[in-house]
């Protein structure tokens, strides 16, 4: 499955929108930094077959979409930017779903992929728990926004590696 060029453009647009969503100066939030233990090895496309990498990307985008679709998220961000961001993510999910269906027919996805998807889910659980512990404060959301920008950047790099493999 060839991910369309529009997919990576969508990822870049999502990153730009997320970058614009900040409401407070991040400089006031240094003490709120937190180690979410991003599962970097899951974004290393070299160790995966294509189907696995696409599944990990899908899970990453799905979890990001879920995180920014909550009521607490709606209260934290400017509505029109949030809607545009969610739309970009939704489009990416559609692209990836088409690929998942196509690729899984070609390759059997081993248990290792389930571990990778679980690692991504646990990462987002840590993010959600942090927001709960910090009572969804503006600084907590700023820290999470920075973290998601970082993980989306990793996703973009994984997509680039996937295209080079084609």
């Amino acid at each position: 499955c060839d991910l369309p060029q529009t997919h990576s453009l969508g990822n870049r647009r999502a990153l730009i929108l997320l970058g614009q969503m900040g409401r407070i100066s991040p400089f006031s939030c240094l003490k709120d930094r937190h180690d979410f233990r991003i599962p970097q090895e899951e974004f290393d496309g070299n160790q995966f077959q294509k189907a696995q990498a696409i599944s990990v990307l899908h899970e990453m985008i799905q979890q990001t979409f879920n995180l920014f679709s909550t009521e607490d998220s709606s209260a934290a961000w400017e509505q029109s930017l949030l809607e545009k961001f969610s739309t970009e993510l939704y489009q990416q999910l559609n692209d990836l779903e088409a690929c998942v269906i196509q690729e899984v027919g070609v390759e059997e996805t081993p248990l290792m992929n389930e571990d990778s998807i679980l690692a991504v889910r646990k990462y987002f659980q840590r993010i959600t728990l942090y927001l709960i512990e910090r009572k969804y404060s503006p600084c907590a959301w700023e820290v999470v926004r920075a973290e998601i920008m970082r993980s989306l950047s990793f996703s973009t790099n994984l997509q680039k590696r996937l295209r080079r493999k084609d």
Epitope: G19, S25, P26, F27, C29, L30, R33, D35, E147
Partner: antibody, heavy 121, light 107 residues
Framework: EVQLVQSGAEVKKPGESLKISCKGS????????IGWVRQMPGKGLEWMGI????????AYSPSFQGQVTISADKSISTAYLQWSSLKASDTAMYYC??????????????WGQGTLVTVSS | DIQMTQSPSSLSASVGDRVTITCRAS??????LNWYQQKPGKAPKLLIY???SLQSGVPSRFSGSGSGTDFTLTISSLQPEDFATYYC?????????FGQGTKVEIK
């Protein structure tokens, strides 16, 4: 390879203006903040201020607020430190360094080589 | 502003010695504390971040500890290349602030 390359040494007269630069390469320039640090001759390190190149948001140390201006041009991955009217007491070595912002990563892990500014009549 | 106080301001030691430098913050900074090494005419170099994490490429003889207000940088066995000035810096709250430095000299 991550690098921060600063502009060369400057010799200026009191009252003159100056803009020094710090060019980042080998990493995503907008993913890190850039901080500026002053070191006067024979003295310690003093944090001056910081910029987020993604949106040019800045913060200054109260000691330097109004004395200097920090800016950035993300299209050329460069941050700037400028003075509108130099004083003899501005004579120092100025360093830029990258900061991970709100991400959990090492602070000021890469530094520029420094720009020596000498202000003398 | 958070004041950072280092002690001693200078010390003399021999190659192979165990060296300890302390840094005290005027209020709690959790573990948002970094240590830098600076040699004459050179830019500072990050040694330790988040109080105890060793920066990539830094020899394991350097270690950091502490949390809250009191922090320590330890060099387990001083090497000739370790003679330099060491600075602590808090990254808990703006303005970021440095300690005044500790100069490690040859005895």
């Amino acid at each position: 390879e991550v690098q921060l390359v600063q502009s060369g040494a400057e010799v200026k007269k009191p009252g003159e203006s100056l803009k020094i630069s710090c060019k980042g390469s080998g990493y995503s320039f907008t993913s890190y903040w850039i901080g500026w640090v002053r070191q006067m001759p024979g003295k310690g390190l003093e944090w001056m201020g910081i910029i987020d190149p993604s949106d040019s948001d800045t913060a200054y140390s109260p000691s330097f607020q109004g004395q200097v201006t920090i800016s950035a041009d993300k299209s050329i991955s460069t941050a700037y430190l400028q003075w509108s009217s130099l004083k003899a007491s501005d004579t120092a070595m100025y360093y830029c360094a990258r900061h991970p912002g709100l991400n959990w990563a090492p602070d000021f892990d890469y530094w520029g080589q420094g720009t020596l500014v000498t202000v003398s009549s | 502003d958070i004041q950072m106080t280092q002690s001693p301001s200078s010390l003399s030691a021999s190659v192979g010695d165990r060296v300890t430098i302390t840094c005290r913050a005027s209020q709690s900074i959790d573990d948002f504390l970094n240590w830098y090494q600076q040699k004459p005419g050179k830019a500072p170099k990050l040694l330790i971040y988040f109080a105890s994490s060793l920066q990539s490429g830094v020899p394991s003889r350097f270690s950091g500890s502490g949390s809250g207000t009191d922090f320590t940088l330890t060099i387990s066995s001083l090497q000739p290349e370790d003679f330099a000035t060491y600075y602590c810096q808090q990254s808990h709250t703006l303005p970021l602030t440095f300690g005044q430095g500790t100069k490690v000299e040859i005895k």
